[in-house]
C-alpha cells in the first residue's frame, strides 16, 4: 500500500470575524495507526489547536467522526473566529508509539485570514474650548480591523475636509490593525450646531461605512457682545439701565453690576433666549435711584463667560439734572467707557 499522504486542499481560507472556519484535511491511507493533530504555525513554537487523542478543545469540532478507524477525513471547524486566530494551520498525522506518538507526516498548511470589522470610530476634540477663528484638532480612532486596507474621510456639516493626517498601525504584518487620524478645523461663530464626522470604509462593511461624530458645541466658545443702554424714566428719581448680552455660547455666564466700582448686584444667566445659530442672548437691568447720588454715577456691566476673564461695558449717569430718555452704546471694552449723555 502506498505511504500515507496528508492532503490540505486549501492553500488559504478567508473568514469573517465571529464566523466559523473550516480547515480541510484528508489522509490517503489508514496506516499507520495514530492520532491526527492540528497546529497553528510550524517549528518548536507551534500552537496545538486540536489533538484527536486527548485534551479539551471547546472551539473545535470535527467534520466527520474521527473516533472511527476507517475515517480518513480529519477536517475541523473552529468557531467564533477572531483576528488572533489568523495564521497557517497544519494537519499532522502521528504514528502510535512509545513513550510518545511520533510525528509521521504533515500537510502543506492552510493559511487562515480573518476579515474583522473596524470598531465604531471614536471622535474626540480638544480638551479646552476655543473661540471662532481659532484652529482646533479632532482625532478619530478605530481598532481591530483586518485586512489593513482602510479609507478614512473627515466631514464638517457634510463638506469633506482636506487638512488631516492619518496613520494605520502597525506598519508590518499583524492579526489586526488600528487607524488614527487628526483633522484641523477652523471654528466660526456659526459652529454651535456644526458636526465633525469621521467616516471609515472597509471591505468588511460592504459599502456601508462607519461614522463617528463630534458636536462642535462641545468645542466652541462664542464670547458675548455687550450693550448697555439707559431706558426711559420709570419714576421721578429712578433710571432703568439694561445690559444686553448677545450671541454667547455656552450658556454658563455670570453678570455683575457695579456702581462707581462697587458691586451692586450679581446674577447668573437663567432665562436666556436661543438664537437660530445656537448662541444665546440675555438681558439684565438695573434700577438706579438718582436721588441717592450726589455725584455722577458710573455704571458697569461686567460679564464672566464660561470661566473666562471678565469683559465689561460702562455707562455714565449724570445726576445734575433729571435724565430723560437716552441711549448709550459704549464701544470701550473692559472698564473703559465712551460717554454720550443727552440732557
Amino acid at each position: 500500500e502506498e505511504e500515507l499522504q496528508v492532503i490540505q486542499p486549501d492553500k488559504s481560507v478567508l473568514v469573517a470575524a465571529g464566523e466559523t472556519a473550516t480547515l480541510r484535511c484528508t489522509a490517503t491511507s489508514l496506516i499507520p495507526v495514530g492520532p491526527i493533530q492540528w497546529f497553528r504555525g510550524a517549528g518548536p513554537g507551534r500552537e496545538l489547536i486540536y489533538n484527536q487523542k486527548e485534551g479539551h478543545f471547546p472551539r473545535v469540532t470535527t467534520v466527520s467522526d474521527l473516533t472511527k478507524r476507517n475515517n480518513m477525513d480529519f477536517s475541523i471547524r473552529i468557531g467564533n473566529i477572531t483576528p488572533a486566530d489568523a495564521g497557517t494551520y497544519y494537519c499532522v498525522k502521528f504514528r502510535k508509539g512509545s513513550p510518545d506518538d511520533v510525528e509521521f507526516k504533515s500537510g502543506a498548511g492552510t493559511e487562515l485570514s480573518v476579515r474583522a470589522k473596524p470598531s465604531a470610530p471614536v471622535v474626540s476634540g480638544p480638551a479646552a474650548r476655543a473661540t471662532p477663528q481659532h484652529t482646533v484638532s479632532f482625532t478619530c480612532e478605530s481598532h481591530g480591523f483586518s485586512p489593513r486596507d482602510i479609507t478614512l474621510k473627515w466631514f464638517k456639516n457634510g463638506n469633506e475636509l482636506s487638512d488631516f493626517q492619518t496613520n494605520v498601525d502597525p506598519v508590518g504584518e499583524s492579526v489586526s490593525y488600528s487607524i488614527h487620524s487628526t483633522a484641523k478645523v477652523v471654528l466660526t461663530r456659526e459652529d454651535v450646531h456644526s458636526q465633525v464626522i469621521c467616516e471609515v470604509a472597509h471591505v468588511t462593511l460592504q459599502g456601508d461605512p462607519l461614522r463617528g461624530t463630534a458636536n462642535l458645541s462641545e468645542t466652541i466658545r462664542v464670547p458675548p457682545t455687550l450693550e448697555v443702554t439707559q431706558q426711559p424714566v420709570r419714576a421721578e428719581n429712578q433710571v432703568n439701565v439694561t445690559c444686553q448680552v448677545r450671541k454667547f455660547y455656552p450658556q454658563r455666564l455670570q453678570l455683575t453690576w457695579l456702581e462707581n466700582g462697587n458691586v451692586s448686584r450679581t446674577e447668573t444667566a437663567s432665562t436666556v433666549t436661543e438664537n437660530k445659530d445656537g448662541t444665546y442672548n440675555w438681558m439684565s437691568w438695573l434700577l438706579v435711584n438718582v436721588s441717592a447720588h450726589r455725584d455722577d454715577v458710573k455704571l458697569t456691566c461686567q460679564v464672566e463667560h464660561d470661566g473666562q476673564p471678565a469683559v465689561s461695558k460702562s455707562h455714565d449717569l449724570k445726576v445734575s439734572a433729571h435724565p430723560k430718555e437716552q441711549g448709550s452704546n459704549t464701544a470701550a471694552e473692559n472698564t473703559g467707557s465712551n460717554e454720550r449723555n443727552i440732557y
Epitope: P35, Q52, K53, K68, R69, K96
Partner: antibody
Framework: EVQLVESGGGLVQPGGSLRLSCAAS????????MHWVRQGTGKGLEWVSA???????YYPGSVKGRFTISRENAKNSLFLQMNSLRAGDTAVYYC????????????WGQGTMVTVSS | DIQMTQSPSSLSASVGDRVTITCRAS??????LAWFQQKPGKAPKSLIY???SLQSGVPSKFSGSGSGTDYTLTISSLQPEDFATYYC?????????FGQGTKLEIK
Amino acid sequence: EVQLVESGGGLVQPGGSLRLSCAASGFTFSSYDMHWVRQGTGKGLEWVSAIGTAGDTYYPGSVKGRFTISRENAKNSLFLQMNSLRAGDTAVYYCARGGNWDDAFDIWGQGTMVTVSS
Amino acid sequence: DIQMTQSPSSLSASVGDRVTITCRASQGINNYLAWFQQKPGKAPKSLIYTASSLQSGVPSKFSGSGSGTDYTLTISSLQPEDFATYYCQQYNSYPYTFGQGTKLEIK
C-alpha cells in the same frame, strides 16, 4: 447493524489444526484492523493475533509460528489458521474489530469454543 | 512485553456505591488503554478507549482517567447490571496485553 460472528470451533486433538472464521457485516470490513482474542475457561482475556488494513500481521510469542491470521476483504471474512494445537490453546476465541482511530477494540463477536484434548 | 496489573482482583460493593478499579502498566503506554466489561458466558463489551474516551453508547457513569503507567476506571453509582468482571488492556504496542481482571460482586 454492525456484527461479527465466529465459527469453526470444536474439539481437536493436541498437535491438530483448526481454522476459525469470523464473518463481518454492517461495516466496510477492509477499512478496519481485525483481531483475535481468546479466553480460557475461568481465565482472563489474551490477545492472539492482529491483521491490519494492508495485510500486516502481528502475534504474541505464545502462538507465533503456529497461528496464521488472514482476511478476505471481498467476502468480509477474517480467519485464524491454528496448527500444532496444545491443551493450553483451549479457550473461547473471539474476533474483535479495531474500530477506533487508535485501534481500540469496539465490536466483539460472541465467540467460538476450541477444545484441544485427546 | 508490557505487563498489566489490575487491582483489586475482586471487589464487593452495594448498589449506589462509587467504585474505582486501577490498572498499572510495567512501562508507559501513552494513554493507549482500554477498559472492558464482561458478564458470565458473554463476550466482552468495550467501555473506554484512549484512557478516558467513552465508547459510543456507554453510559456516562463510567469514566476513565490516568496517564503514563497508572490508570483508573470509575463507576459513579453502581446499578445491578454493573456487577461483572472488568479488564484493562494496553494497545500501545504489540503484543497487546490485558490485566488479569477485577470481579465486581454485590455485597
